[in-house]
């Protein structure tokens, strides 16, 4: 008694797929595979298959049902923090060759990495024109201010909304200040946060307000404090710089905007007699902490002149180092003071029309605004590699 195995039905390739090998007929143990065109994937039900091969069985049936070649779907694109995504090809179309466009929230954010245009590729990933599969980045625009500099020198003035949107109030032991960098870092003076270096959460960080005691502000909390390794507490103010990492990104708006870091070319806007602006809630002429955010425009002082001013007692020799810059009037009266520590001394970059931080309020004479003495500020441009390393590492 003998029996011959039934040939299997001729395999009809699914739409957008093809059969291989093509044979006149398929008998017992013959097999075929299905390959999909570029941009299509093998699906059984809605589950993807890496490959598909069917084998002809003795009873003349294939051992597996025919799959489908379904167009690749990249799925809904990820949300972009501080940005949005628009569908270019069609309403919600996310399949092969569909195009989407990411953009950042206007005015306050700018796109980094690429142009934001992504295409759904055959591998099922949204891919930029540069071949990146990661999201673009919406980076806060820095150095925007409602204020335009007039270049004149005048006394302590009340700040208006949006004048110093990078200004940060730091409470925790003493009153100090800082300046927002990006959307989750604060630049400040090491001496202002030294006591909290091992207890970052003790820092109460407030921004987006003009009034020191106002209940209306944006609260931020510290995740970590990074004090420059060259700073020695109670032994002068060299390397008086620190960074605070916030535990959440803050939302950027007209009242909360980061300050720019100085470009390589920044020194050309910080020469002797160039005007910088210091702001804070520190002591005023009346001897009390300011209720309203105040600012003062002050000129940069020749470094040798400043060094000489602090060479005589009670100041130890070498108090003013190359990591510092000085600002103020020889006649006195215009200065930063206690409570302003850690705040930014800012300058307008006339090429980019953005404000940048040139100095950090560090120290000065016992009597603020004293004639022949000057406010001393940490020279930020000397610390750009340090700042960039900390921010990129953490």
């Amino acid at each position: 008694y003998t029996s011959t195995a039934q040939p299997c039905p001729y395999p009809m390739a699914p739409p957008n797929g093809h059969v291989s090998p093509v044979q006149a007929k398929y008998i017992l143990k013959d097999s075929f595979s299905i390959f999909c065109e570029t941009g299509y994937e093998l699906l059984q039900g809605h589950l993807p298959l890496k490959s598909f091969t069917a084998v002809c069985q003795k009873d003349g049936s294939w051992d597996r049902p025919m799959p489908a070649c379904s167009i690749v779907d990249c799925g809904p694109p990820d949300d972009l923090p501080s940005g949005r995504v628009e569908y270019i090809t069609g309403p919600g179309v996310t399949t092969y060759k569909a195009v989407i466009q990411y953009s950042c929230e206007e005015t306050f954010y700018t796109m980094k990495v690429n142009d934001g245009k992504y295409v759904c590729e055959a591998d099922g990933f949204w891919t930029s024109s540069k071949g990146e599969k990661s999201l673009p980045v919406c980076e806060p625009v820095c150095g925007l201010s409602a204020r335009t500099t007039g270049g004149r020198i005048y006394g302590g003035q009340k700040a208006k909304p949006g004048d110093f949107p990078w200004q940060v109030l730091i409470l925790g032991g003493t009153t100090a200040a800082g300046a927002l960098l990006y959307d989750n870092w604060v630049l400040t003076a090491a001496h202002a946060v030294y006591e909290q270096k091992h207890d970052a959460s003790a820092l109460d960080i407030r921004m987006g307000t003009l009034k020191r005691l106002s209940p209306h502000y944006t609260q931020a909390w510290s995740e970590a404090v990074f004090i420059h390794e060259g700073y020695t507490h109670d032994a002068g103010f060299d390397n008086d710089i620190a960074l605070i990492k916030l535990n959440n990104k803050v939302v950027i708006n007209s009242n909360i905007t980061p300050i720019c870091l100085p470009r390589k070319e920044a020194e050309s806007f910080m020469r002797t007699d160039d005007i910088g602006t210091a702001s804070g809630w520190g002591l005023t002429q009346r001897g009390f902490l300011a209720r309203n955010l105040m600012y003062v425009d002050i000129p940069i002082v020749d470094h040798q002149k400043c060094t000489a001013a602090y060479e005589k007692p009670p100041y130890p020799r070498g108090s003013v180092t190359a990591n510092m810059l000085c600002a103020g009037l020889e006649s006195g009266g215009k200065d930063s003071c206690r409570g302003d520590s850690g705040g930014a001394l800012v300058f307008l970059d006339s090429e980019t029309e953005r404000w940048f931080v040139g100095g950090i309020v560090s120290w000065g004479s016992m009597n603020c605004g004293e004639a022949g003495q000057y406010g001393v500020y940490t020279k930020v441009i000397n610390y750009i590699p340090w700042i960039e390393n900390i921010i990129s590492d953490f």
Partner: antibody
Amino acid sequence: QVQLQQSGAELAKPGASVKMSCKASGNTFTNYWMHWIKQRPGQGLEWVGYINPNTGYTDFNQKFKDKATLTADKSSTTAYMQLISLTSEDSTVYYCTLQLGRNFDYWGQGTTLTVSS
Amino acid sequence: DIVLTQSPASLGVSLGQRATISCRASQSVSSSRSTYIHWYQQKPGQPPKLLIKYSSNLESGVPARFSGGGSGTDFTLNIHPVEAEDTATYYCHQSWEIPYTFGGGTKLEIR
């Protein structure tokens, strides 16, 4: 935040036509799709069609192809739906809804159409 | 056209209990990457409001007592614990293909 403001209630005679509007304001987008949805009292939602105000491209539910015309004025960010040859079957609430992703993200408050002789 | 069949048509649930609404599609509305079913809530005199997108993703601002699941052709919306303000009609919606379609709705009443 996007807001959609639809035109007020309409009263029309059978056989007439009516044109309702939907104005988008707030954080409007370059590429979005304005859809129109019909909802009869006590009944479900029926998709009529959409327009891309940026390109003027439209697509319809076949059922409404000869009933509805969709247009948009890009400069005023206003979309329009005209319904023709009105019958009592057209008496109901029509919503405009703005689609950014694959779902309807923002809705107008609805325009009530009453067809009566 | 894809037909979405919702059940039950109406549902009475006691305060604090679980409400489960089903939606069955006449064909698969899932790809290997995503599922194109969304759930809306509609209260009398108001437009629908998006609750859940892509089968299980909660829309921002929607309470966590709402959850969704399923893939292929069978989907569910769960509300637990049900609150008095959840009295509304709930619709499933597919954006897998045009014409977009909606389920017939499920009217939820709180006892």
